[in-house]
């Protein structure tokens, strides 16, 4: 007789994830040899025992520990970049920016970048046909505290001027409820961080309006300036040329606003 | 100078077996994740399996899951794959490739698998 | 799987000729692309990692760009040397997948 299997309103596990781990852990190792030390076996052992065998709506930060502790690494607190809700155009500039870092170019956050994952109580069972949705099922899924995890670990460990890439395009272009929002904003720690800088990408050609006076930029500023960090913002009207000018600094177009 | 040498192609009958060698050279074989690809006659490239460094990972593509084994003797530098249950479907040219940083920078010359009755 | 459309499947040009390939990716891979390229009864050999890095060895002419889904490998000045098959590779998901290849005929 089969065994009942929870149906969640998630998609399920990545095909081949425990491949693409490690396949990830191993290539992050050979590009970055300050990294050479970590056993990448090992840090998929932590991964997996950080959700294996777990009811998937019961997971903690404590589960995630040895794996945080595996993938321990030291980034230029001075050169972080946080996103909302523009990951791309946020990897895309710190891969021409290579003294910038963004989450996912740390070992933790490449590893599971775009990845879902989920696991059976009591059971060894990797779950491939649905995970917990955050909002339909449970919050503290595996892939939810993952990110909180290190997101919280990321914003703690930045010093000086941190700046976040905000999408102008979004309703809310800053959501409180975002991991942005929620998270990072609240584990900035205002004894090293001087300064928030938000660069507001602008998504019309034609869109010339100035986003930081926008209501959720003001919220935003508001709770930065509460937690005694100062707070500064840019609009950055031409993402294109953005990208391009940080390719090619010294083109002539590149004085002119972006 | 790195070099990848495989060996053990030929003629087989469709549900036969055959074993193929990849002797590597130039480099720690034991460092780095080899990988199996394949092209059939006039195809494009088709990934086949790769086994890490250490050699407790070992990963197939779905077409060949069950039939095929890749293993490594880091005593002799050398990746094998057994090929069980060959179908007419396996005829290809097969390639020992290793990896770094996520391209297969070295690849051997390829050695002619045809199953055929 | 990500699947990966390369076009054009073929093209004709010639010597000095500027040419361009492009890679389309199913779903977003950041910059986890490679370009190869495959004479006839050659294995292939690797020119792009990284989606813009260039292998040593590797005539300056070839260069990658591209991040997200769209890809682009590009020859500067088309040498009667690079008539070949050009297939690019991500390794963003596993298993890592081809594209189905560019032939390249020089005019």
């Known amino acids: 007789v089969p065994r009942w299997r929870q149906q969640w309103s998630g998609p399920g596990t990545t095909k081949r994830f425990p491949e693409t781990v490690l396949a990830r852990c191993v290539k992050y190792t050979e590009i970055h040899p300050e990294m050479r030390h970590v056993d990448c076996q090992s840090v998929w052992d932590a991964f997996k025992g950080a959700f294996i065998s777990k009811h998937p709506c019961n997971i903690t930060e404590e589960d995630y520990q040895p794996l945080m502790k595996l993938g321990t690494q030291t980034v230029p607190c001075n050169k972080i970049l946080l996103w909302s809700r523009i990951k791309d155009l946020a990897h895309q500039f710190t891969q021409v920016q290579r003294d910038m870092f963004t989450l996912e170019d740390t070992l933790l956050g490449y590893l599971a970048d775009d990845l879902t994952w989920c696991g059976e109580f009591n059971t060894s069972k990797i779950n491939y046909q649905s995970c917990p949705d955050w909002r339909k099922d449970c919050s503290n899924n595996p892939v939810s505290v993952f990110w909180k995890t290190v997101s919280r670990r990321f914003a703690e460990a930045a010093c000086d001027v941190v700046h976040v890439m905000l999408n102008g395009s979004r309703s809310k272009i800053f959501d409180k409820n975002s991991t942005f929002g929620s998270v990072e904003v609240h584990n900035l720690q205002p004894e090293k961080v001087q300064t928030l800088e938000a660069w507001v990408i602008h998504g019309g050609r034609e869109d010339s309006r100035d986003l930081c006076q926008d209501p959720t930029i003001k919220e935003l500023e508001s709770i930065i300036s509460k937690r005694n960090i100062q707070f500064s913002c840019k609009n950055i009207y031409r993402p294109d040329k953005f990208l391009q000018c940080v390719k090619n600094p010294e083109d002539s177009s590149c004085t002119s606003e972006i | 100078q790195v070099q990848l040498v495989e060996s053990g192609g030929g003629v087989v009958q469709p549900g036969r077996s055959l074993r193929l060698s990849c002797a590597a050279s130039?480099?720690?074989?034991?460092?780095?994740?080899m990988h199996w690809v394949r092209q059939a006659p006039g195809k494009g490239l088709e990934w086949v399996a790769v086994?890490?460094?250490?050699?407790?990972?070992?990963y197939y593509a779905d077409s060949v899951k069950g039939r095929f084994t890749i293993s490594g003797d880091n005593s002799k530098n050398t990746l094998y794959l057994q090929m069980n249950s060959l179908r007419a479907e396996d005829t290809a040219v097969y390639y020992c490739?290793?990896?770094?940083?996520?391209?297969?920078?070295?690849w051997g010359q390829g050695t002619l698998v045809t199953v055929s009755s | 799987a990500i699947q990966m459309t390369q076009s054009p499947s073929s093209l004709s040009a010639s010597v000095g000729d500027r040419v361009t390939i492009t890679c389309r990716a199913s779903?977003?891979?950041?910059?986890?692309l490679g370009w190869y390229q495959q004479k006839p009864g050659k294995a292939p050999k690797l020119l792009i990692y990284a989606a813009s890095s260039l292998q040593s060895g590797v005539p300056s002419r070839f260069s990658g760009s591209g991040s997200g889904t769209d890809f682009t490998l590009t020859i500067s000045g088309l040498q009667p040397e690079d008539s070949a098959t050009y297939y690019c590779l991500q390794d963003y998901i596993y298993y890592p997948t081809f594209g189905q290849g560019t032939k390249v005929e020089i005019k």
């Open positions: 490739a290793r990896m770094f940083r996520g391209a297969f920078d070295y």
């Open positions: 086994i890490w460094y250490d050699g407790s990972n070992k």
């Open positions: 130039g480099f720690t074989f034991s460092s780095y994740g």
């Open positions: 779903q977003g891979i950041r910059n986890d």
